[in-house]
């Protein structure tokens, strides 16, 4: 005998009470897929989670953080303390990042700061503990006496026009 | 080990107060963040409220809201309920719970470590 169930739509389950009729799933409840026996309970956000997209018959809640935390987990399953700019997160709580390093975001850890002699470059801007350094040309191309990096344009004759 | 005591439960009437208490050891409290959750005769487990690490952000139910206070003495390593204005349906066993990653707020399905419970009736 063909399993009726196996026609029963996504936001519907299959009722065995009622001769395997589609039923619609209850209020709160959702199937994602076709062929459910029974709907899923809808997943409520609440405390420091709030509702990113509402629970339908065929798809379940998404849950966000509020202000001053941020997700963690699949499907946002934790809510993470953020911290300032220039601090990471530790064991003992939100701490300054250590000289030589940065964070330009309120979460993650501190980075160290990009060493610009590694690409024969100076330091153009020094960094900060929420900023990165900014790297500019290379130590030979500032010394003084050295070539411009554009080469200036030939002089002309006066009277003549350019070939 | 992760160890967690509640008490304070008992039978009060409506209208009544409650602070329940719930005792922690075996890890550094100060840095987790700590829930009630309730459980009335035949339900399910229904959260009540959270409370951060610091102690300075709270969530709670909405059929709380308003009566029930979450604290924490982490100086005490000691997690609080006050609970006024008791009504029939705050009659439950309450557990307090911990978190499972430090300066984190978790769905109870991934609470680590749950108190054995303290009973609350509220009848006349």
């Known amino acids: 005998l063909q399993d009726l169930c196996s026609n029963c739509p996504a936001g519907t389950f299959c009722d065995n009470n009622r001769s395997q009729i589609c039923s619609p799933c209850p209020p709160n409840s959702f199937s994602s897929a076709g062929g459910q026996r029974t709907c899923d309970i809808c997943r409520q956000c609440k405390g420091v989670f709030k509702t990113r997209k509402e629970c339908s018959s065929t798809s379940n809640a998404e849950c966000d953080c509020i202000s001053g935390y941020h997700c963690l987990g699949a499907e946002c399953s934790m809510c993470e303390q953020d911290c300032k700019q220039g601090q990471e997160l530790t064991k003992k709580g939100c701490k300054d990042c250590c000289f030589g390093t940065f964070n330009d975001q309120k979460r993650g850890i501190c980075r160290p700061w990009t060493n610009c002699s590694l690409d024969g470059k100076s330091v153009l801007v020094n960094g900060t503990k929420e900023r990165d350094v900014v790297c500019g040309p290379s130590p030979a191309d500032l010394s003084p006496g050295a070539s411009s990096a554009t080469p200036p344009a030939p002089a002309r004759e006066p009277g003549h026009s350019p070939q | 080990q992760v160890q967690l005591v509640e008490s304070g439960g008992g039978l009060v009437q409506p209208g009544g107060s409650l602070r329940l208490s719930c005792s922690a050891s075996?890890?550094?409290?100060?840095?987790?963040?700590m829930s009630w959750v309730r459980q009335a005769p035949g339900k399910g487990l229904e959260w009540v409220s959270d409370?951060?690490?610091?102690?300075?952000?709270?969530f709670y139910e909405d059929s709380v809201k308003g009566r029930f206070t979450i604290s924490r003495d982490n100086a005490k390593n000691t997690l609080y309920l006050q609970m006024n204005s008791l009504r029939a349906e705050d009659t439950a066993v309450y557990y307090c719970a911990k978190h499972p990653l430090t300066f984190t707020i978790a769905t109870m399905n991934d609470y680590d470590y749950w108190g054995q419970g303290t009973l609350v009736t509220v009848s006349s």
């Open positions: 409370i951060n690490s610091g102690g300075e952000s709270t």
């Open positions: 075996g890890f550094t409290f100060s840095s987790y963040a």
